[in-house]
Interface confidence: medium
């Protein structure tokens, strides 16, 4: 029969062969034969595979650092990673709570929607059209841009989300 | 590298006022939002006040507005907070804080005791 050129769902090809991949929570020890099963093995301790993979080495859970203010809210498995948490008060920077923060700040382009209290964190709105912030703050909200109109000057540059318009004198020419 | 070095604090009575300063180093101080946070004793973090990069937008927790007062001398890389009609639950090290990452770019505070 000819070698197959694809193989089924949860199984990978090798040697133009087709070998069953290892479960969630095993990692691969050797590829099948065509006399033997592929052989996969349980991770350690502290390791985890979350797919169904041929990978040969688990990979670490997260470790939460209790110096970064993290502390773990799910414990890992052999098939699910570490789930970090921040101390209460805290707000993680990130889906990933890599780190804390008392308060997030909204990045240039956003402004704060609702300042943070006690229970919640900072909630950052994009600043529309007409409007900019151009810091990264956890008070500030968008600024309206500059009237030039009002000051009897023209835009010479145009505002964006992350800075204000230029305002230029008109020109006096007239034809 | 960042530094932050905070003085001022000290024992003061009920109703008493001080002012706590906070030297800044190592950085561009005039970009930067400052804040004050407070640690009172057996308890959290509390944000207390913050103040934008130029010094001219201020903000306050409750339990501190009318009676501490944010100021910044960009020219001396300064952070002030004027604190007022102290009361005892304002018993706690204060802090001087560039960014609000967990003890990240942190002076090692200042004592505030408020007793009779």
């Known amino acids: 029969p000819e070698p197959p050129t694809a193989c089924r769902e949860k199984q990978y090809l090798i040697n133009s062969q087709c070998c069953s991949l290892c479960q969630p929570g095993q990692k691969l020890v050797s590829d099948c034969t065509e006399f033997t099963e592929t052989e996969c093995l349980p991770c350690g301790e502290s390791e985890f595979l979350d797919t169904w993979n041929r990978e040969t080495h688990c990979h670490q859970h997260k470790y939460c650092d209790p110096n970064l203010g993290l502390r773990v809210q799910q414990k890992g498995t052999s098939e699910t990673d570490t789930i970090c948490t921040c101390e209460e008060g805290w707000h993680c920077t990130s889906e990933a709570c890599e780190s804390c923060v008392l308060h997030r700040s909204c990045s240039p382009g956003f402004g704060v929607k609702q300042i943070a209290t006690g229970v919640s964190d900072t909630i950052c709105e994009p600043c529309p059209v007409g409007f900019f912030s151009n810091v990264s703050s956890a008070f500030e909200k968008c600024h309206p841009w500059t009237s030039c109109e009002t000051k009897d000057l023209v835009v010479q540059q145009a505002g964006t989300n992350k800075t204000d318009v230029v305002c230029g004198p008109q020109d006096r020419l007239r034809a | 590298e960042v530094q932050l070095l905070e003085s001022g604090g000290g024992l003061v009575q009920p109703g008493g006022s001080l002012r706590l300063s906070c030297a800044a180093s190592?950085?561009?101080?005039?970009?930067?939002?400052m804040q004050w946070v407070r640690r009172a004793p057996g308890k959290g973090l509390e944000w207390v006040s913050a103040i934008s990069g130029d010094g001219y937008r201020t903000y306050y927790a409750d339990s501190v507005k009318g009676r501490f007062t944010i100021s910044r001398d960009n020219s001396k890389n300064t952070l002030y907070l004027q604190m007022n009609s102290l009361r005892a639950e304002d018993t706690a090290v204060y802090y001087c804080?560039?960014?609000?990452?967990?003890?990240?770019?942190w002076g090692r505070g200042t004592l505030v005791t408020v007793s009779s």
């Open positions: 804080a560039k960014e609000l990452l967990y003890f990240d770019y």
């Open positions: 190592g950085f561009t101080f005039g970009w930067y939002e």
